[in-house]
């Protein structure tokens, strides 16, 4: 079978063919200082395209709680504080790992989980379809 | 200590009161369709603080490939298409969960890691300071 | 972005050859193990091949030994899959894949139909 090279005293799993489980370590390595999206920045209130943030909670993942931009206005605000629906405001998603339980409950073994969360909100010009 | 309560027939720890290392399912469960920043949406390039994205690849991460966004311009763009210095286009920044080898090179060994990337770029009111 | 673009199947007799081709674009090809992966009809995904970044490891699932040759080319971002005697049970989608770090696919293309038939 395909073999993956190995080094001395790494881990086994149970298929080196073809690995489907391995071995994480949760002693995160956090290459950042802030991780709240709230105090970072107040950009979510200066925008031109404001945003909210809810918070989406699931104690069966991790992170067990992510924090998703809702767009306040479908335009974005004008120089006079108004909504210009002449523009749009927009969504920029990102996608994201996570880690589910699974089996639920079990403390020690997790799925990796591909996942879509708006991180803020962005102002766009509208595309525009002419009708013939 | 504090125990996670544990269905009958999840894997076993060495530590079930804190648990360090977690066996993880690789058969990625991917809840999107499209995960190609560009393909996905043209935001980048229609936005009033439109961003470039730039590859951050790194073979022994997984994801391997991340783009970044770099903000365009230091203001926003206005409805003539001119560069408005009035305004501050700024990056929209996102944890993200990655995996990485550790020990190096070994394939069923990881660790996880915390990166903040820049999404996309929003265009906010800048803060002005009043000299007394 | 990344892309993988897989050419070169077709329909072939058995005992005929074909050789794949797959061009990489988005990443930096030659810090990846890249591998081809098949799927037949109606069956699972499964690993034909892979290849070392210098391309000085190659492994082979057994059923191809001796018959397939993985190969690449650096300089012009490519992969390879040269496949001889061929045979009826090597119909399949071939998939050009780039290899993650846990040793399975991170991406790959689109694919490209092989048959072998008389």
């Known amino acids: 079978g395909i073999t993956i090279p190995r080094n001395p005293g790494c881990p086994n799993s149970e298929d080196k063919n073809f690995p489907r489980t391995v071995m994480v370590n949760l002693n995160i390595h956090n290459r950042n200082t802030n991780t709240n999206p709230k105090r970072s920045s107040d950009y979510y209130n200066r925008s031109t395209s404001p945003w909210n943030l809810h918070r989406n909670e699931d104690p069966e993942r991790y992170p067990s709680v992510i924090w998703e931009a809702k767009c306040r206005h479908l335009g974005c605000i004008n120089a006079d504080g108004n909504v210009d629906y002449h523009m749009n405001s927009v969504p920029i998603q990102q996608e994201i790992l996570v880690l589910r339980r699974e089996p639920p409950h079990c403390p020690n073994s997790f799925r990796l989980e591909k996942i879509l969360v708006s991180v803020g909100c962005t102002c766009v010009t509208p595309i525009v379809h002419h009708v013939a | 200590g504090i125990t996670i309560p544990r269905n009958p027939g999840c894997p076993n720890s060495e530590d079930k009161n804190f648990p360090r290392t977690v066996m993880v399912n690789l058969n990625i469960h991917n809840r999107n369709t499209n995960t190609n920043p560009k393909r996905s949406s043209d935001y980048y390039n229609r936005s009033t603080s439109p961003w470039n994205l730039h590859r951050n690849e790194d073979p022994e991460r997984y994801p391997s490939v991340i783009w970044e966004a770099k903000c365009r311009h230091l203001g926003c763009i206005n409805a003539d298409g001119n560069v408005d210095y009035h305004m501050n286009s700024v990056p929209i920044q996102q944890e993200i969960l990655v995996l990485r080898r550790e020990p190096p090179h070994c394939p069923n060994s990881f660790r996880l890691e915390k990166i903040l990337v820049s999404v996309g770029c929003t265009c906010v009111t800048p803060i002005v300071h009043h000299v007394a | 972005q990344v892309q993988l673009v897989e050419s070169g199947g077709g329909l072939v007799q058995p005992g005929g050859s074909l050789r794949l081709s797959c061009a990489a674009s988005g990443f930096t090809f030659s810090s990846y193990w890249m591998s081809w992966v098949r799927q037949a009809p109606g069956k699972g995904l499964e690993w034909v091949a892979k290849?070392?970044?210098?391309?000085?490891?190659?492994d082979y699932v057994d059923s191809v030994k001796g018959r397939f040759t993985i190969s690449r080319d650096n300089a012009k971002n490519s992969l390879f899959l040269q496949m001889n005697s061929l045979r009826a049970e090597d119909t399949a989608v071939y998939y050009c894949?780039?290899?993650?770090?846990?040793?399975?696919?991170?991406?790959w293309g689109q694919g490209t139909l092989v048959t072998v038939s008389s």
């Open positions: 290849i070392k970044q210098d391309g000085s490891e190659k």
């Open positions: 894949a780039r290899e993650s770090i846990f040793g399975i696919p991170e991406d």
